[in-house]
């Protein structure tokens, strides 16, 4: 068991042209807190997947507001330490995630608004125990500086916080075959209770007489180095010397997330997807409160009085996520009907309706003919939600207010002549042809294609079109 | 990924039709929070959007003012590609056809994978 | 052609930051989320901003997006040499009910 440590020592404007404007101004004054993850190994997983070795928030910055036309210099810190307590061995190896959020505290509906200002990321072997770590991320126009570390928690010790100390039970000397303690000389090394000969830099141990395996190494001591090639049944070859995985018992057999955590295989080990409220290698660490201010962008904290006891973020609309720090596609939900089309605006949805159609998500359709007259004797006719007039004749346009040329379209076969007439046309047909549209021939026998003509009209005389 | 491959000719005569294909891998034109866009870009006229399909329950489309009266765009759910027809082309058409998705969900209007662009000519 | 109106050309040389403007009307930019894209000569275009402000994820964030009014803006701070491009807003519009884009800019970085 231990602690990681995060020191933030400035958060400002990187070296070089382009400095960043203020996060904060007079208008909206804003303060900054910080955010750290950590995963074991050298993992390079999104910013999203669970912080598996923990994670912690600081306290909220002094109120920071902008001197008008001043550069924006380094930003207030919270004051203390992240610290970031592990129950197993420290890993050795961690990606790291630091995130930097503005906490605006201008007149939010609702209470702050909270947006992630950077975020940087990195991979670091680390020894516990060690000195400080100083390190120096950008991001974008950003810069953040920061110290790190690893602390074992007594009684452990060493690089991995798996070796035992206890006070020494003589004034002098520490008992038979057990070193002092270093950098604790007061203290001695514990009995040994692992499995007798468990490697002490690759092995650990909760229970007496077991050997339990830091990643990357395996074998019944942890003396073997894990190696994903030649590996030839679903968890590896039984031989030892190979330096695959042993075949038997799966790492998620028995369930080692606690909490209700949900064990899933990675290619070396078990990662745990804990619930609200706990993290850590098995979803053993519950120590964000609400008093932490655990939930983003607006959200409610609701429970998580003590550090024993899960809280729950109730996150304000287009927000998701245990944290609400996750922004929810909320046009995925496909609210807008009738084909309009979902805009997520942030501060509100909106559906863009096709012509025809209204109403917040597009649900009404329009009677587009109510109070819509149609000119000159028109008739109106609705389809599909939109508005359409069946003009008279002689009559066109979408209102029917537009004159219409009935000859425009060359209606007459044959070389017919066609005449506007005051209720149509009038096709004057060609020698040889007769009809409306002077569609048909006249037979040569005088005989036409048509049964008779109509009485009064002799074959080739106009023929109106009614 | 997504990528949007364009095919069809370069050159085309006056009066006959424009046809273009754009071909969707790594999404679907049928996908119900996407629209599938053809646009062309010219010297004299800039970047102008021409119209778009996409499937909301049924398809639906929607066209330029300046060539509606000429234009089809048509999906083929079952070659996933989607299609450009340009009517009665004259060389004012002449442009550089690209076919792009607003595939940003919440934000349709926003054009975020692109074709590689097929340069046409009209001319006889 | 274009109904929406930018500068032909902006400069700057390396660290400055460029701002370039977009001005339309009530029925595109006044009521319609606003869209930005860079062109680099024979490719496509690349979608830099969308809904007015929000950045692509690989868009680096020297390049930001406002809105105001029926105007638009987009900022890039710290301007490099590869942001030498076409710039181009775009908006839907409500009245002739497709997208419109902008005349484009031509943003050059002196050296």
């Known amino acids: 068991a231990g602690v990681f440590e995060l020191q933030i020592h400035s958060f400002g404007p990187g070296p070089g042209p382009g400095a960043p404007r203020s996060p904060c101004s007079a208008r909206l004054p804003c303060r900054l807190f910080f955010r750290v993850c950590l995963k074991p190994g050298l993992s390079e997983e999104a910013a999203e997947s669970p912080c598996a070795l923990g994670a912690a928030l600081s306290a909220r910055g002094p109120v920071y507001t902008e001197q008008p036309g001043a550069p924006a210099p380094d930003l207030p810190l919270p004051d203390g330490l992240l610290q970031v307590p592990f129950r197993d061995a420290w890993p050795g190896t961690f990606s790291f995630i630091i995130e930097t959020w503005r906490e605006e505290l201008g007149d939010q509906i609702g209470g702050p608004a909270w947006s992630l200002l950077a975020r940087v990321a990195g991979r670091r072997r680390l020894a516990a125990g060690g000195p400080w770590a100083r390190d120096i991320q950008r991001a974008g126009a950003w810069e953040l500086r920061f110290s790190y570390r690893a602390r074992c928690e007594p009684p452990a010790v060493g690089t991995a916080c798996t070796r035992l100390c206890r006070p020494r039970s003589a004034p002098s000397r520490c008992g038979p075959g057990l070193r002092p303690c270093a950098p604790l000389e007061d203290e001695c090394e514990a009995p040994l209770v692992c499995r007798a000969g468990c490697s002490p830099e690759h092995g650990f141990c909760e229970q007496p007489g077991e050997c339990r395996c830091l990643e990357g190494w395996t074998g019944p001591l942890c003396t073997v180095p894990v190696s994903t090639s030649s590996c030839l049944s679903p968890r590896g070859p039984s031989s030892a010397t190979t330096g695959c995985l042993v075949p038997g018992p799966g790492p998620c057999d028995g369930n080692p997330c606690a909490n209700g955590g949900s064990c899933s295989e990675t290619p070396r080990s078990f990662e745990c997807t804990c619930p609200r409220g706990f993290y850590g290698l098995r979803c053993e660490v519950s120590g964000v409160t609400c008093a932490d201010g655990p939930c983003f962008n607006g959200g409610l904290c609701v429970g998580g009085a003590d550090p024993d006891s899960a809280y729950i973020c109730h996150c304000p609309p287009g927000f998701q996520g245990s944290n609400c720090e996750k922004r929810v596609d909320r046009c995925s939900l496909q609210p807008c009907r009738n084909g309009g089309l979902c805009l997520d605006l942030g501060h509100a949805l909106r559906c863009r309706c096709r012509a025809g159609f209204a109403g917040p998500r597009c649900e009404h359709d329009l009677d587009d003919c109510a109070g819509r007259a149609c000119a000159n004797g028109g008739t109106c006719v609705e389809g599909g939600g939109a508005h359409r007039c069946s003009c008279a004749l002689g009559f066109g346009g979408r209102d029917c207010r537009e004159r219409a040329d009935p000859c425009a379209a060359r209606p007459c076969a044959h070389g017919g002549r066609c005449y506007a007439h005051f209720s149509g046309l009038v096709c004057a047909c060609a020698p040889g042809y007769m009809g409306a549209r002077c569609e048909f021939p006249v037979h040569p026998d005088g005989a036409s294609a048509l049964p008779a003509a109509p009485p009064g009209l002799r074959p080739g005389d106009p023929q109106r079109y009614l | 990924q997504v990528q949007l491959q364009q095919s069809g000719p370069g050159l085309v005569k006056p009066s006959q039709t424009l046809s273009l294909t754009c071909a969707i891998s790594?999404?679907?034109?049928?996908?119900?929070?996407?629209?599938w866009n053809w646009i062309r870009q010219s010297p004299s006229r800039g970047l102008e959007w021409l119209g778009r399909?996409?499937?909301?329950?049924?398809?639906?489309?929607d066209y330029a003012v300046s060539v509606k009266s000429r234009i089809t765009i048509n999906p083929d759910t079952s070659k996933n590609q989607f299609s450009l027809q340009l009517n009665s082309v004259t060389p004012e058409d002449t442009a550089v056809y690209h076919c792009?998705?607003?595939?940003?969900?919440?934000?349709?209007?926003?054009?975020?994978?692109w074709g590689q662009g097929t340069m046409v000519t009209v001319s006889s | 052609q274009s109904v929406l109106t930018q500068p032909p050309s902006a400069s700057g040389t390396p660290g400055q930051r460029v701002t370039i403007s977009c001005s339309g009307s009530s029925s595109n930019i006044g009521s319609d989320p606003v869209s930005w894209y860079q062109q680099f000569p024979g490719t496509a275009p690349k979608l830099l901003i969308y809904t007015n402000n929000q950045r692509p994820s690989g868009v680096p964030d020297r390049f930001s997006g406002s809105k105001s009014g029926t105007s638009a803006s987009l900022a890039i701070s710290g301007l490099q040499s590869e942001d030498e491009a076409d710039y181009y807003c775009?908006?839907?519009?409500?009245?002739?009910?497709?997208?419109?884009f902008g005349t484009g800019t031509k943003v050059t970085v002196l050296t």
């Open positions: 790594g999404d679907s034109v049928s996908s119900n929070s996407v629209v």
């Open positions: 792009a998705r607003g595939g940003i969900v919440g934000a349709p209007d926003a054009f975020d994978i």
């Open positions: 775009a908006a839907w519009d409500d009245s002739l009910n497709g997208h419109v």
């Open positions: 399909t996409y499937y909301r329950s049924k398809w639906y489309d």
